[in-house]
């Protein structure tokens, strides 16, 4: 009776279990009743990092110097290239696909410390009573407007991203 499931590092095809190709190799042909799975090593600048049945290897990541990137760790047939940014620059994400001089603080956060040559921008959440409605690399959280000092009342509460909205007091006739 043909199998419905295969062991680890195997895959089911044509009602039989074939061996997966090991990391660093791609599939050339599936196994048959009489032959083993045929695999081939990935070419230069290619990789596969898992046991697989892929017919094409993945291209190594390119660390584009025009984006401020350089190679942190050269790729192998089993691993992708790891990029990092030029000295003094910061990756925009874990994948490090582009570089920025320093990060900015999103709305709801203020700048606690402006970036220097050796440290990135330090952001802090705006506490109650303060807000920031912009992305910035220098602006702190701003205090909510004080409606009382303008002889007005709060019509809409403030948040960490928005100022309070003041309005006229209801006058009793």
């Amino acid at each position: 009776e043909p199998p419905t499931a295969c062991r680890e590092k195997q895959y089911l095809i044509n009602s039989q279990c074939c061996s997966l190709c090991q990391p660093g190799q791609k599939l050339v042909s599936d196994c048959t009743e009489f032959t083993e799975t045929e695999c081939l090593p990935c070419g230069e600048s290619e990789f596969l990092d898992t046991w697989n049945r892929e017919t094409h290897c993945h291209q190594h990541k390119y660390c584009d110097p025009n984006l401020g990137l350089r190679v942190q760790q050269k790729g192998t047939s089993e691993t992708d290239t790891i990029c990092t940014c030029e000295e003094g620059w910061h990756c925009t994400s874990e994948a490090c696909e582009s570089c920025v001089l320093h990060r900015s603080c999103s709305p709801g956060f203020g700048v606690k410390q402006i970036a220097t040559g050796v440290s990135d921008t330090i952001c802090e959440p705006c506490p109650v009573g303060f807000f920031s409605n912009v992305s910035s690399a220098f602006e702190k959280c701003h205090p909510w407007t004080s409606c009382e000092t303008k002889d007005l009342v709060v019509q809409q509460a403030g948040t960490n991203k928005t100022d309070v909205v003041c309005g006229p007091q209801d006058r009793l006739r």
Partner: nanobody
Amino acid sequence: EVQLLESGGGLVQPGGSLRLSCAASGFTFRDYEMWWVRQAPGKGLERVSAINPQGTRTYYADSVKGRFTISRDNSKNTLYLQMNSLRAEDTAVYYCAKLPFFFHEWGQGTLVTVSS
């Protein structure tokens, strides 16, 4: 494509003044915080000054406070840096930059040399 073109640099004597300009294109200038950053020979990048999109709030590094003034004209898509009482230590290439400071969105800079 974002383009930032700095101009106005040159050779000036200590105590002199210069006004740098940065012509911006390829993005909505009025929506972005803008910065002036400089790089002295053999040194790292130094954040000099910044201005918010509306031009109502500014930042200055301690080294230039009271001597430099940042401003912007959103109708002309241009950023300015008025530099007074220049010192030898202000010698550097000056760059303008927009948030979020992508490496590939920088201009070529303009060289300011302060020397007698």
